[in-house]
């Protein structure tokens, strides 16, 4: 699995999407787990409704919510009020019995709010991260860039 990078702004919401083959994963509940390091174990954060037919209902654990479009084959995770400690490795998983298949590996990056002048010295334009030469970046910054503002480049 390649890692997909989702970048969000501190204090805002970040939506992570995990597409999957709806036929292959028919009848399976899904989960969102946090990985402790690149090779570490994955700790469950939140999972979809116990009844698969009700997977479209939003389930929440703290500031993290999950919902599953089982027909369209898209699992959506929303992280509200994004904080620095939310950054890290996650996985979208498809559950079957005690096993879990990885649908997508995700790296969540939390960007300093460019409009938060209290922390102007911390404005982050990420540098090259050699961890993810093949990582795909999904920009999920939820507002338009200001005129003349440099967009955050991917961490490769």
């Amino acid at each position: 699995h390649n890692t997909t990078v989702f970048q969000g702004v501190e204090g805002q919401s970040l939506q992570v999407s995990c597409p999957y083959d709806s036929m292959k994963h028919w009848g399976r509940r899904k989960a969102w787990c946090r990985q402790l390091g690149e090779k570490g174990p994955c700790q469950r954060v939140v999972s979809t409704h116990n009844l698969w037919l009700l997977s479209f209902l939003r389930r929440r654990n703290g500031s993290t919510a999950i919902t599953d479009d089982t027909l369209g084959g898209t699992l959506t995770i929303t992280l509200r009020n994004l904080q620095p400690h939310d950054a890290g490795f996650y996985q979208c998983q498809s559950l079957h019995g005690s096993e879990a298949d990885t649908l997508r590996k995700v790296l969540v990056e939390v960007l300093a709010d460019p409009l938060d002048h209290r922390d102007a010295g911390d404005l982050w334009v990420p540098g090259e991260s050699e961890s993810f030469e093949d990582a795909h970046v999904e920009h999920s910054i939820s507002r338009s860039l200001l005129e003349g503002e440099i967009p955050f480049p991917p961490t490769s």
């Epitope: 402790l36 790296l107 990420p126 991260s129 961890s131």
Partner: antibody
Framework: EVQLQQSGAELVRSGASVKLSCTAS????????IHWVKQRPEQGLEWIGW????????KYAPKFQGKATMTADTSSNTAYLHLSSLTSEDTAVYYC?????????????WGQGTSVTVSS | DIQMNQSPSSLSASLGDTVTITCHAS??????LSWYQQKPGDHPKLLIY???NLHTGVPSRFSGSGSGTGFTLTISSLQPEDIATYYC?????????FGGGTKLEIK
Amino acid sequence: EVQLQQSGAELVRSGASVKLSCTASGFSIEDFYIHWVKQRPEQGLEWIGWIDPENGDSKYAPKFQGKATMTADTSSNTAYLHLSSLTSEDTAVYYCHADHGNYGSTMDYWGQGTSVTVSS
Amino acid sequence: DIQMNQSPSSLSASLGDTVTITCHASQHINVWLSWYQQKPGDHPKLLIYKASNLHTGVPSRFSGSGSGTGFTLTISSLQPEDIATYYCQQGQTYPRTFGGGTKLEIK
């Protein structure tokens, strides 16, 4: 018991090379990244690089490229650090260190260190 | 490479004191910072990971805070066994880099 056991102290001539070993017990090195860290006498810590024993992938700090070569043998659960063209600057204690990589690893194991002394 | 500036380089404090060590990163590193303690003749030991998480078995008098570029290690009620050198290390990008260390001594 989980531990990393490093090879014994080395006294080597300038210009020679040396190979240090780090053997894991209580866990499989394939499940971890093995890092090597250098500490010169009365100095701070310098990260040399890591190797992923599962596939042999490695990353080096630019300063140590060409100087250090990391390898791993999963059958003996051992990681190696080869240092070439030794000079007095290479006199240091070298530590091996296992963790789950960047982004929040909660695992952290260290070897006791191997002292390398380069004599002219 | 990301530079880690640690201060002070040495520190003298009395038993029972609260001690603060700071680490400043040359680039934003989010919360990817660890603190290590090293006693003479011993290997470094992880105290804090991910800026503020206490590693297993580490006494609760140790605490970490910060994100972005500024980080702090605090030792409340200094104990004799806390005499050591403390290092910060960034884990945002490779190469990983350490701060220069803070040598803590008893006054």
